[in-house]
């Protein structure tokens, strides 16, 4: 038995969970997925059994050896996979676990304003990035991008202060998660303080 | 220093298949999508493909697809599996990084040529 | 695949001249734009991304604007070393595509 293989995988994607097996005589093979059985082979007679019938299409076995495929990721086959040797020359099952994370391809990230103040000339107020459909293990990072800054900044909420005055700044939120990054439609300072001046209720921008 | 060195490439016959890689160094790999790039002679660039740093996802040029493969280890390597080559894929192969993971690309490496002949 | 044209394919100037290339992206971009020079024989080199924004160790003298659709690199000051061919990328959707180059000269 092996330490736990942590495997990463995007919705409508493929994984391979890798099994390298020093075992001679097998007698079957079992894969289960949160306890659940999943796939049984048995190597003599060239038997592969699929539990569920909709794993069927999805489940393959490269090359002739046994190592699991599993095709046509969904989001809720992220789990604990669990492997079992077993044969009449091993006193007990060799096995084998694996932590599968399956991640969702992100769209454009939404920003959102916060409640914005203009006192003696500046602008201030928070831009808040999301995921629309709340898609997990997100990472936002701003840009600030203009003539005096090219700033970087972490998390997805961006305070912001801004100069009536003062050069323009364009911001744009950078969405990433372990499969994917996408980045927002960029946010000008000059507009988004005009309009603020206009609507002091928080609004999507 | 930062580095991306190509090798792999030469003279194929229409075709062959070969086999490119891309050795990274000055830089924790493991963190960065990337990214191969091709140029044909006198000609533009061409991006073909890209993978993250788990290879869990691969995006390529959709007209590139079918013939091209990129992966990687965790070894300091990417790699682009050519197949069924065709004089047109004569060019130049450069493995490049965007700059701080974004998409564009601050860092080239020398790249190789590929030459499709008979 | 999101086409981008620029132009023009070439041009001559004098050193001190302003030079402006474009490149005009078949659909709206936003601002994801990146430029890039490429000297003879040499692997290209990042200018500009963002449309605007200068890679670090950019002279000033380059310089990038625009948004949606039409986009300009602007050198102000031609230099000798300015020879090189420069492309734009847009990086807004899959594929990532190139424009076809604009090779500058020196008259």
């Known amino acids: 038995s092996g330490p736990v293989k942590e495997l990463v995988g995007s919705v409508g994607g493929a994984v391979t969970f890798p099994l390298k097996s020093k075992v001679k005589q097998v007698d079957s093979i079992v894969w289960t997925f949160n306890t659940t059985p999943l796939v049984t082979i048995q190597p003599e007679g060239g038997t592969i059994i699929v539990t569920q019938n909709r794993n069927r299409e999805r489940v393959d076995f490269p090359d002739g050896g046994y190592s699991l495929k599993l095709s046509k990721l969904k989001k809720n086959d992220s789990g604990i996979y669990y492997v079992g040797i077993y044969s009449s020359s091993l006193q007990q099952p060799s096995t084998q676990e694996y932590v599968l994370h399956v991640y969702e391809h992100l769209s454009k990230p939404k920003v959102t304003m916060g409640l914005q103040s203009n006192k003696n000339g500046t602008c201030v107020t928070n831009l808040t990035c999301c995921m629309e459909h709340g898609e997990e293990d997100v990472i936002y990072t701003w840009k600030a991008l203009g003539q005096a800054a090219n700033e970087s900044h972490n998390g997805s909420i961006l305070p912001i202060s801004w100069r009536w005055g003062e050069s323009d700044m364009t911001f744009i939120c950078v969405a990433r998660n372990p499969v994917s990054r996408n980045f927002s439609s960029p946010i000008l300072a000059r507009k988004l303080c005009e309009g603020a001046a206009d609507d002091p209720d928080s609004s999507m921008v | 220093e930062v580095q991306l060195v190509e090798s792999g490439g030469g003279l194929v016959q229409p075709g062959g298949s070969l086999r490119l890689s891309c050795a990274a160094s000055?830089?924790?790999?493991?963190?960065?999508?990337m990214s191969w790039v091709r140029q044909a002679p006198g000609k533009g660039l061409e991006w073909i493909g890209e993978i993250n740093p788990d290879s869990s996802t691969i995006n390529y040029a959709p007209s590139l697809k079918d013939k091209f493969i990129i992966s990687r280890d965790n070894a300091k390597s990417l790699y682009l599996q050519m197949n069924s080559l065709r004089a047109e894929d004569t060019a130049v192969y450069y493995c490049?990084?965007?700059?701080?993971?974004?998409?564009?690309?601050?860092?080239w490496g020398q790249g190789t040529l590929v030459t499709v002949s008979s | 695949d999101i086409q981008m044209t620029q132009s023009p394919s070439s041009l001559s100037a004098s050193v001190g001249d302003r030079v402006t290339i474009t490149c005009k992206a078949s659909?709206?971009?936003?601002?994801?734009v990146a430029w890039y020079q490429q000297k003879p024989g040499k692997v290209p080199k990042l200018l500009i991304y963002w449309a605007s924004t200068r890679h670090t160790g950019v002279p000033d003298r380059f310089s990038g604007s625009g948004s949606g659709t039409d986009f300009t690199l602007t050198i102000s000051s031609l230099q000798p070393e300015d020879v090189a061919t420069y492309y734009c990328?847009?990086?807004?959707?899959?594929?990532?595509?190139f424009g076809q180059g604009t090779k500058v000269e020196i008259k």
């Open positions: 990328q847009q990086y807004s959707s899959y594929p990532y595509t």
């Open positions: 659909q709206d971009v936003g601002i994801a």
């Open positions: 490049a990084r965007p700059d701080g993971n974004y998409w564009y690309f601050d860092v």
């Open positions: 000055g830089f924790d790999f493991s963190r960065y999508w």
